[in-house]
């Protein structure tokens, strides 16, 4: 299709080489309540539409995304050629930064309802470059935590080194929806609730003599509870003895509850004690079986191919640890009579 009629937007992604970050492009097609996908917008270039159309995933019309090769080759279907770019209804999500993401991205509706819709498309010219390390030492992270029940703030990473006074006007989106009532480089949240969690996008305009660009950054905001003050507790095994059949395989499960920690490094190991000897057993990887806001339950199993007489003289110890301390639970095997 002919892309010369597409509306054009220029975006700049200045990514940090120090941290992982994502990027998002919105397919800013006009309002869905009009009879066609495309119509002449009532907004002047300086106005922002009140919300991005099609932001509720249940109700979005599907759009097709393409990338325009710089050599003039035909448009490429994003889904086929770029595994690190995820198409999610009306957004394009870049999972990894890199200058190779630089290029022109085009979106248009999948369902063409009328000849007029053919020209309904948006072309986004994306320039990607690494942020110069000199620009700012303590710039805001692309992953920010808000402590539930307390005061917090969400900073726009690309502007966090500027004072509020010198900061340009910022356009914020939360989960693809415009936050029209917030225009500074930092959003203050007086009391944090779970609903403040989400993907925030901050945009501001940067102009030079030739053209103007939208500088965009994406912030993943997580609402968290305070770090636990407790060491982990072992939920299973409860009993210190376990009846077993000799010669049969056996799996002993260790389940432990770890309280939330912002820097979470749980330790879960199985040891075997035999007389004066003690050694760690290589067992399958631990796995998270339940995760909530406040805690996480982790399980790790020890597997015996067949129970021997020697195993009855041994003690099997599950050891769990977090930054506060450790807990153990010992299990002695007893032959079933």
């Amino acid at each position: 299709f002919n892309i010369s009629g597409c509306s054009t937007k220029k975006l700049l992604w200045a990514y940090s080489t120090r941290s992982e970050e994502e990027f998002i492009l919105f397919c800013d097609l006009p309002e869905p309540q009009k009879s066609h996908f495309c119509h002449r917008s009532q907004l002047s270039p300086t106005q922002v539409p009140d919300h991005l159309p099609f932001t509720d995933s249940k109700d979005l019309p599907d759009v097709q995304w393409y990338r325009q090769p710089s050599n003039g080759d035909p448009l490429e279907d994003i889904r086929k050629s770029y595994p690190h770019i995820i198409q999610d209804k009306c957004t394009l999500r870049f999972l990894t930064p890199g200058v190779n993401n630089t290029g022109s991205y085009i979106c248009r509706p999948k369902m063409i309802k009328s000849p007029y819709d053919v020209a309904c498309c948006v072309k986004m010219i994306l320039e990607v470059k690494p942020q110069s390390n000199a620009s700012c030492e303590n710039s805001a992270s692309h992953k920010q935590d808000l402590l539930l029940g307390s005061t917090g703030s969400i900073s726009c990473p690309s502007l966090s080194c500027q004072s509020d006074a010198q900061s340009p006007e910022v356009t914020w989106y939360k989960n693809g929806k415009l936050l029209s009532m917030t225009r500074s480089n930092r959003i203050v949240v007086d009391e944090v609730y779970i609903y403040h969690q989400g993907t925030y996008v901050c945009d501001y305009t940067q102009s030079d003599t030739a053209s103007s660009w939208t500088v965009r950054a994406v912030v993943q905001v997580r609402t968290i509870v305070g770090d636990t003050k407790l060491k982990p507790d072992i939920l299973d095994p409860v009993e210190s003895t376990l009846e077993v059949e000799l010669g049969k395989p056996l799996t002993i499960s260790c389940k432990a509850r770890f309280g939330f920690e912002r820097v979470f490094n749980p330790v879960m190991k199985w040891y075997i004690k035999d007389a004066d000897l003690e050694w760690e057993v290589s067992v399958p990887e631990a796995k998270s079986i339940k995760s909530t806001l406040k805690d996480e339950i982790i399980e790790r199993n020890i597997i015996l191919e067949k129970v021997t007489q020697r195993d009855l003289r041994r003690t099997f110890v599950c050891f769990v640890q977090n930054s506060i301390g450790n807990t153990t639970q010992s299990v002695q095997l007893k032959e079933k009579r």
Partner: antibody
């Protein structure tokens, strides 16, 4: 408890302006957006706009753009709604209403309302 | 602007009746819908937010359902204090818009 107290009734001539105040108490004033809604006699509810008391940012309904101004005074926890170039159709009860969720978020609903201010426009 | 259409515009019912009011949006609004009750000479009162969540302090006989474009407010057993006008309101995008209202009168 959370309360919104509005200024008293006003009678105005066509072409004049009216400024209605809404004093908030019982909660952190800057944490919640404030809406303005009006209701003409015997009619339904009509949303006029919203103000963020923290930064003073506003969004107005297109119908009132150019005629309405919403402001706030954080020192007195008061928001104001001024409507200019009044006409007889502006005769209504004007309500301020607090947004139900701590900003910034999706609009949730207006959980606390002022008692309303009757504005009569008559020559 | 998103148009909100409420039906019926009025209804007569008796104490103990089950009452259902519907609201239709001109485009999908997901679950961004609120219901209010208003009595003569008083300010509206929030009953339901996010289509189905009961505002604190509101009796459990009030319930809301729906998503997308079609929504319902149900009063399971009408009480004398429930005779009032009910409004739906979308909070999906500005301008926020209200339905025309449904007046619930005594039969």
């Amino acid at each position: 408890q959370v309360q919104l107290v509005q200024s008293g009734a006003e009678v105005k001539k066509p072409g004049a302006s009216v400024k209605v105040s809404c004093k908030a108490s019982g909660y952190t004033f800057t944490s919640y957006y404030m809406h303005w809604v009006r209701q003409a006699p015997g009619q339904g509810l009509e949303w006029m706009g919203i103000i963020n008391p923290r930064g003073g940012y506003t969004t107005y309904a297109q119908k009132f753009q150019g005629r309405v101004t919403m402001t706030r005074d954080t020192s007195t926890s008061t928001v104001y709604m001024e409507l200019s170039s009044l006409r007889s159709e502006d005769t209504a009860v004007y309500y301020c209403a607090k947004e139900g969720r701590v900003s910034p978020t999706d609009y949730y609903g207006m959980d606390v309302w002022g008692q309303g201010t009757t504005v009569t426009v008559s020559s | 602007d998103i148009q909100m259409t409420q039906s019926p515009s009025s209804l007569s019912a008796s104490v103990g009746d089950r009452v259902t009011i519907t609201c239709r949006a001109s485009q999908s609004i997901s679950s961004y819908l609120n219901w209010y009750q208003q009595k003569p000479g008083k300010a509206p009162k929030l009953l339901i937010y996010d289509a189905s969540s009961l505002q604190s302090g509101v009796p459990s006989r009030f319930s809301g359902s729906g998503s997308g474009t079609d929504f319902t407010l149900t009063i399971s057993s009408l009480q004398p204090e429930d005779f009032a006008t009910y409004y739906c309101q979308q909070s999906y995008s500005t301008p926020l818009t209200f339905g025309g209202g449904t007046k619930v009168e005594i039969k």
